[in-house]
């Protein structure tokens, strides 16, 4: 499904005030002690990654017992492990009570800039994408993903963090936005609406999609998330819109079928490893890209957003399961967990393909108003 040319559709801003960005990208891993060399963290040592900062939660420095032996992604070792195979995990266990950024919610108080001043920044996310105004940039090559196909064991941690459902990803998932722009995946999470109300974060010409997946990555130039926050290109998020289609999506079903187990806020379960790339569109060559922020506190800027042109299809039942199963804080349903779109403030969205060219026969001669800023660097 390519992104349709949308009519202005009043965004059903699902209870999300301009600053409802849940922690910048859900839950960035927190700092934890590395495991004893002889005890690589096991599958259940996976951090809940429930705590990626901002996009659902930023990491906080919190020591972890050696017994649990789980490195967090920030402490990924170099390729050649010096000791017994250690198993760095994207640990995101944070003591939320001690984290000011944990006290935020979608809509209402406190205003996000009070939670994190960065949420009032000029270059925030999400944004409304207007293909006709996007700058075609031939230098944007197809994305490259490596190691995203995971065997069923060890299992991965799936968590309801009160803001989203988040899957912690193991080390070794590598993504390249282009030559020299390399990243490691940390976690993925979803944003959705409610019955009859779409809940994607990004919009296309004002059209909001039913849901959106975010796969959060840390640049290989940084060892830890807290070092990368706010640094240009320090974090990168792959985003794809989820739409209703006629068939069940078997890749998503592996996660959606487990949501009942984590209906309660703060609960988590273990799920078999799966092909993470199957959760994304198949066309890695056509996408929009811009620099923005985490969409939840701390709303750190410098995040490279890549939004796929192709959408992912889920059945109506699956979309209903996503939006109607989980509970958030205060005995309220976890729904409409998206932030309102933010002003571009002069930013130009780039496209890896001539998005301004409408393929429909009635289209007028397209006018590409913006030119590509990237020169391939």
């Amino acid at each position: 499904q390519r992104l349709p040319r949308m009519q202005e559709d009043s965004p059903l801003g699902g209870g999300s005030s301009g600053e409802d960005d849940p922690l910048g990208e859900e839950d960035l891993p927190s700092e934890e002690d590395s495991p004893r060399e002889e005890d690589p963290p096991g599958e259940e040592d996976l951090p809940g990654e429930e705590d990626l900062p901002g996009e659902e939660d930023l990491p906080e420095v919190k020591p972890k017992s050696e017994e649990e032996g789980s490195l967090k992604l920030e402490d990924l070792p170099t390729v050649e492990a010096p000791g017994d195979p250690q198993e760095p995990q994207n640990n995101a266990h944070r003591d939320k009570e001690g984290d000011d950024q944990s006290h935020w919610r979608y809509g209402g108080d406190p205003p996000w800039p009070r939670v994190s001043p960065a949420c009032a920044g000029r270059f925030q996310s999400p944004v409304d994408i207007r293909p006709q105004l996007a700058a075609f940039c031939p230098a944007l090559r197809p994305l490259e993903l490596l190691g995203f196909q995971l065997p069923p064991l060890p299992e991965l941690r799936l968590r309801n963090n009160g803001h989203s459902v988040q899957l912690t990803l193991p080390p070794g998932l590598e993504m390249a936005l282009g030559p020299g722009r390399e990243y490691r995946a940390l976690q993925l999470h979803l944003h959705w609406g409610a019955a009859g109300r779409p809940g994607s974060e990004h919009t296309v010409e004002g059209h909001r999609f039913p849901a959106e997946i975010h796969v959060v990555h840390l640049s290989t130039a940084f060892a830890r998330v807290d070092e990368a926050l706010g640094r240009p290109g320090g974090l990168a998020v792959l985003a794809a819109f989820l739409e209703e289609g006629p068939e069940e999506n078997s890749a998503y079903e592996q996660l959606l079928s487990r949501l009942e187990e984590i209906a309660e806020e703060g609960s988590e379960t273990q799920v078999p490893g799966l092909d993470i790339s199957a959760l994304l569109p198949s066309d890695f060559s056509r996408y929009f890209q811009y620099e923005g922020s985490l969409t939840t506190p701390p709303c750190a800027q410098g995040v490279i957003w890549t939004v796929f042109n192709q959408t992912v299809m889920l059945s109506a039942k699956q979309l209903h399961t996503l939006s109607d199963t989980l509970w958030g804080p205060g005995d309220s349903r976890l729904q409409l967990n998206f932030r309102a779109t933010q002003p571009l403030n002069g930013r130009v969205i780039e496209a890896s393909f001539p998005a301004g060219v409408d393929s429909s026969p009635r289209a007028a001669e397209p006018v590409q108003l913006n030119s590509c800023l990237a020169a391939g660097d």
């Epitope: 002889e38 096991g42 995990q89 060890p154 299992e155 193991p170 070794g172």
Partner: antibody, heavy 119, light 111 residues
Framework: QVQLVQSGGGLVQPGGSLRLSCAAS????????MTWVRQAPGKGLEWVSA????????YYADSVKGRFTISRDNSRNTLYLQMNSLRADDTAVYYC????????????WGQGTMVTVSS | QSVLTQPPSVSGAPGQRITISCTGS?????????VHWYQQLPGTAPKLLIY???NRPSGVPGRFSASKSGTSASLAISGLQAEDEADYYC???????????FGGGTKLAVL
């Protein structure tokens, strides 16, 4: 030091049963997936079965499905392989191994225990 | 017949460099699953030699290296020593079989 100590092998008649045990020490047993691998005399390694850290998910090779059952007792730090309806071609050295561990495969192995199925 | 194909045997003189190939398919190595290598000395249990395609655990000499490309992988041993005489196995996961799979093993003889 991290180790896996196996027991329970022996001679059994075709159609018989046997239970292998694998005792783990010096690591947090319940956080690791565990696996059984076997090696027939003079042959290569063959994956048999695996279980998640919690014991909630189990996996089997087609050759043993329906006959073998993998289980674990995390309170005792012990892995088990219950083998029923044994056949001559099940004769092998059986190894328990820690893993698959994220990106590390099977990183710690038991010493192996011989299972002979013969009449 | 093993899902991952290895040569049954290789040999080399001390000090030489040898390689052992491991050929799979699009449902295992080619599907981007990690490849691990194990060394089994005579009469002992296998030992992890290389993990995640090209990484050495501590205690494994730098003479051992490995790589992966497409649907195959290879193990290289340089500066061959007598104590390297053993059986070597590659291992991965196969999404079609839904099983962890091993190569048939390669017997290394140091002449």
């Amino acid at each position: 030091q991290v180790q896996l100590v196996q027991s329970g092998g022996g001679l059994v008649q075709p159609g018989g049963s046997l239970r292998l045990s694998c005792a783990a020490s010096e690591f947090t047993f319940g956080t690791y997936a565990m696996t059984w691998v076997r090696q027939a005399p003079g042959k290569g390694l063959e994956w048999v079965s695996a279980v998640s850290g919690s014991g909630g998910s189990t996996y089997y090779a087609d050759s043993v499905k329906g006959r073998f059952t993998i289980s674990r007792d995390n309170s005792r730090n012990t892995l088990y392989l219950q083998m029923n309806s044994l056949r001559a071609d099940d004769t092998a050295v059986y190894y328990c191994a820690r893993g698959p561990v994220l990106r590390y495969g099977f990183d710690i192995w038991g010493q192996g225990t011989m299972v002979t199925v013969s009449s | 017949q093993s899902v991952l194909t290895q040569p049954p045997s290789v040999s080399g003189a001390p000090g030489q460099r040898i390689t052992i190939s491991c050929t799979g398919s699009r449902s295992n190595i080619g599907a981007d699953y990690d490849v691990h290598w194990y060394q089994q000395l005579p009469g002992t249990a296998p030992k992890l030699l290389i993990y995640a395609n090209n990484n050495r655990p501590s205690g494994v000499p730098g003479r051992f290296s490995a790589s992966k490309s497409g649907t195959s992988a290879s193990l290289a041993i340089s500066g061959l020593q007598a104590e390297d005489e053993a059986d070597y196995y590659c291992q991965s996961y196969d999404s079609s079989l839904r099983a962890w799979v091993f190569g048939g093993g390669t017997k290394l003889a140091v002449l």
